[in-house]
Amino acid sequence: MKVLQEPTCVSDYMSISTCEWKMNGPTNCSTELRLLYQLVFLLSEAHTCIPENNGGAGCVCHLLMDDVVSADNYTLDLWAGQQLLWKGSFKPSEHVKPRAPGNLTVHTNVSDTLLLTWSNPYPPDNYLYNHLTYAVNIWSENDPADFRIYNVTYLEPSLRIAASTLKSGISYRARVRAWAQCYNTTWSEWSPSTKWHNSYREPFEQ
């Protein structure tokens, strides 16, 4: 039994890091393999992750981590019984994929303005809380070409757009994702989308 593709990990910088790897043949990951991980820090304890299958030869493990901060570094040991298959390390702050924003809501009752709001996926005492910026994707259900991205580079989780920038009388969907420049993160997954019917008063033409 050998590792074909070494584990690569990403962290949500809150409580979970996800590691994926491939074996050289079909493997029952949960019965045959264990991923041990330990923070390089005073008093830290070793933890064991039981992997799940991710395709025939692929495995995935969700590592539970407390109080993730920039200086943290973890040792990783992949075992098959008594055999050490792979040894490595992982610094969560250098491989961050933020959590997806939640609670995306479209407020249509502001005069001819659409207000989109969503929730920051981190609590205020998490170091990512203050560093997220967002991308909002709006598209028409009727017209695949009517697809737009708004970059929200300020910290407030909201976006105002004039209803007139979208077509009236049709349905739109929106979704939002996040990233943090200061940690050079990847983009989060998209939030679940939300749907609304866009209608506004056309300006009266004389």
Epitope: L42, L43, S70, A71
Partner: antibody
Framework: QVQLVQSGAEVKKPGASVKVSCKAS????????MHWARQAPGQGLEWMGI????????SYAQKFQGRVTMTRDTSTSTVYMELSSLRSEDTAVYYC?????????WGKGTLVTVSS | QSVLTQPPSVSAAPGQKVTISCSGG????????VSWYQQLPGTAPKLLIY???KRPSGIPDRFSGSKSGTSATLAITGLQTGDEADYYC????????????FGTGTKLTVL
Amino acid sequence: QVQLVQSGAEVKKPGASVKVSCKASGYAFTSYYMHWARQAPGQGLEWMGIINPSGGSTSYAQKFQGRVTMTRDTSTSTVYMELSSLRSEDTAVYYCARGKWWWQYWGKGTLVTVSS
Amino acid sequence: QSVLTQPPSVSAAPGQKVTISCSGGSSNIGNSYVSWYQQLPGTAPKLLIYDNNKRPSGIPDRFSGSKSGTSATLAITGLQTGDEADYYCGTWDTSSPPQPIFGTGTKLTVL
């Protein structure tokens, strides 16, 4: 919100012991390390040691080895720092602080006065 | 236990900029992250900067940190009277056993 509430001021005689408590609230107690540091009047900060509330393991600064004991009670989310064989130089404000490499939350401090 | 070296005091007028240095060695600042704490009179220290140059939520961008080699610097712009306090740098000494160490402290006076 995160709060670390420390016990009140103490006056002790040389040779005695003191036990300072730090009650945590507003977060998962066993998920965060707790440090103890002290500050003598008009002086700087001095690290004393650290406890992992999850398993109760500890590490102490060499200067305090043999005189300091840190414990925790998970049922009350409280950590304790006991310092024995007190001398006048131990007169200081004692702080608990939550964190690993740096400390974002601090208790308000407990003044321990050692005087005959 | 080694201690990081800071100037005992610095002063500047309101609105001005001030910098506070923190000098260490290869076994501490040179090999670890630096944090900065503000201690107002009669209160507990408060985290201002972590990870050399990052600010926790609620800390204004008037405060900034930097690190180069074995020394670090805290800069405060647009000084306010409320900034008058003691400032401490902190890091980890990685010699055995590893442990946190602090600077000697700097008293900031706003003239």
